[in-house]
Interface confidence: low
């Protein structure tokens, strides 16, 4: 995932928490948040598994890495980066792996220059609609995100809300229509079963998006045609079965994309037919050689490309009274 | 709907003392920044104090610090300014006033605060 | 502290004009963070404009917002009798947050 990256060096410790309740005062340039590594050169604040509960609240101004990962803040409440003034050089925040199961509307307000947020490998049972927009506008204003990692970030199964964890992924990601702007979104290792079909349509912006190591078993009803600027598609580790004529030829009119397919559980069936056909002309899906049948039983391991139309066929469905258990 | 509703003013002597509550109604409290703002009589807006009520931040204009203490009650959805020591020209409007990125969008009537002797 | 300074303090104008009220800070306002509002007599302030040029919910095209840095402009592109009210400018950036002294915009 594409984490905040930093040159820090000459860090320098801390000195004690502020109070919660923040002083108007702008805080000392030199000022580094207990239980976190500064480098003020670097403009990068690390508070990295130190189990924080909440975010510090003396964050220096000039912060423009920060990284707090491997904590256990539980919840990120509306404003849990307001400052005065705002933390506004603050581009690339990493979240992950801080225990977060709820994240509510508002969030990351006051943060201008939010460019890159990472909350992969928290457990989100509860993402607000207006997590990333912080207005519940019908239009809010653009947010500066330009690239959003939410790898990992499904609950277990007893800690979901009763419903769709897709549909609240997609709810905060099109809420306001504020992240037109976005570029790189990655929502790997999510169980996703689906995708909502008017999700992509409205990012708009994409150049990247991972969905690998999911569950989806089709691809039928998403639409890739307004995606014109997509470079990559990781759709690595599903239950992809085949893809029909509409999702290939989507596929094929995008101008700049490489498509990612390994690992899927491929049925070479007569279905699969016209996929083998574009696979053998298409130059879009990256090591498409790899790519091997998985069922039927007798197709298993063959490679997709090596395939002719007389391997794939369909078992003749019989009469009922014909059938055998 | 959005509502926001100011009570607890009332003409009080100058050195007492008052408390506004501000109750919020029709969104989720802990989603958004809530604000006192004042408006003396034929005079223009002036911001007291600000408070996050999903977390612990909470700023004060250095002019009001000490003497008047802003909270909150999740629980009763309800923002809360403690004013001490009060003086003449503490005579305003006192309004409380919903934020975000983008400005004050919903206000409260106001309740009128009258320090005088 | 940011000292916001609006000009005029009054103006006097008919229904058809074009009415423009600057603001301009003592020091430089991140535009995401320069709102302005109407208030009229009576009654609580209402939210015009967000971020320097975004038009709240409910607000009719006839005002506009623009500026960046120390100095900023409300245009009203034609005066309606409801406009008549005054007008603030407030920085939400710095804490303290500051409104402008208000412009009363009265019928002529």
């Known amino acids: 995932s594409s984490s905040p990256t930093s040159s820090a060096s000459s860090f320098s410790s801390s000195a004690p928490f502020l109070a919660s309740a923040v002083s108007a005062q702008p805080p000392l340039p030199d000022q580094c948040p207990a239980l976190c590594e500064c480098s003020e050169a670097a403009r990068t604040v690390k508070c990295v598994n130190r189990n924080l509960t909440e975010v510090p609240t003396d964050l220096p101004a000039y912060v423009r890495n920060l990284f707090l990962t491997g904590n256990q803040l539980a919840v990120l409440p509306a404003g849990a980066f307001a400052r005065r003034p705002p933390l506004a050089e603050l581009a690339a925040l990493n979240l992950s792996g801080s225990r977060l199961d709820e994240v509510r509307a508002g969030a990351f307000e006051h943060l201008p220059s939010l460019r890159q947020l990472d909350l992969s490998h928290n457990p989100l049972a509860d993402l607000s609609p207006f997590a990333f927009s912080g207005s519940n506008a019908s239009v809010s204003a653009p947010s500066p995100l330009v690239e959003l990692i939410l790898n990992h970030i499904v609950p277990p199964e007893d800690e979901r809300q009763n419903r769709s964890f897709e549909g609240m992924v997609v709810a905060a990601l099109l809420a306001g229509r504020a992240l037109q702007g976005l570029r790189r979104l990655e929502l790997a290792s999510n169980h996703f079963l689906y995708l909502p079909r008017d999700v992509l349509a409205q990012l708009p912006s994409l150049r990247h998006l991972d969905l690998s190591n999911n569950s989806l078993v089709s691809l039928t009803y998403v639409s890739f045609r307004n995606l014109t600027h997509l470079e990559s598609l990781h759709l690595e580790d599903n239950a992809l079965k085949v893809l029909h004529n509409g999702t290939l030829a989507e596929l094929q009119g995008l101008p700049h994309i490489r498509v990612f397919l390994d690992n899927n559980p491929w049925v070479c069936d007569c279905h699969m037919a016209d996929m083998v056909t574009w696979l053998k002309e298409t130059e879009v899906v990256q090591g498409k050689d790899r790519l091997t049948c998985a069922y039927p039983e007798k197709m298993r391991n063959r490679v997709l490309l090596e395939l002719n139309s007389a391997d794939l066929d369909c078992d003749p469905i019989l009469p009922p009274s014909l059938q055998t258990s | 709907e959005v509502q926001l509703v100011e009570s607890g003013g009332g003409l009080v002597q100058p050195g007492g003392s008052l408390r506004l509550s501000c109750a919020a109604s029709?969104?989720?409290?802990?989603?958004?920044?809530i604000s006192w703002v004042r408006q003396a009589p034929g005079k223009g807006l002036e911001w007291v104090a600000e408070?996050?009520?999903?977390?612990?931040?909470?700023y004060y204009n250095e002019k009001f610090k000490g003497r008047f203490t802003i909270s909150r009650d999740n629980a009763k959805n309800s923002l809360y300014l403690q004013m001490n020591s009060l003086r003449a020209e503490d005579t305003a409007v006192y309004y409380c006033?919903?934020?975000?990125?983008?400005?004050?969008?919903?206000w409260g009537q106001g309740t009128l605060v009258t320090v005088s002797s | 502290d940011i000292q916001m300074t609006q000009s005029p303090s009054s103006l006097s104008a008919s229904v058809g004009d074009r009415v423009t009220i600057t603001c301009t800070a003592s020091?430089?306002?991140?535009?995401?963070?320069l709102h302005w509002y109407q208030q009229k007599p009576g009654k609580a302030p209402k939210l015009l404009i967000y971020s320097t040029s975004n038009l709240a919910s409910g607000v009719p095209s006839r005002f506009s917002g623009s500026g960046s840095g120390t100095d900023f402009t409300l245009t009203i592109s034609s005066l309606q009798p409801e406009d008549f009210a005054t007008y603030y400018c407030h920085q939400y950036h710095r804490s303290p947050l500051t409104f402008g002294g208000g412009t009363k915009v009265e019928i002529k």
């Open positions: 408070i996050y009520p999903g977390s612990n931040s909470i």
């Open positions: 020091s430089s306002v991140n535009s995401n963070y």
């Open positions: 029709g969104y989720t409290f802990t989603d958004y920044v």
């Open positions: 006033a919903r934020g975000g990125n983008y400005g004050f969008d919903y």
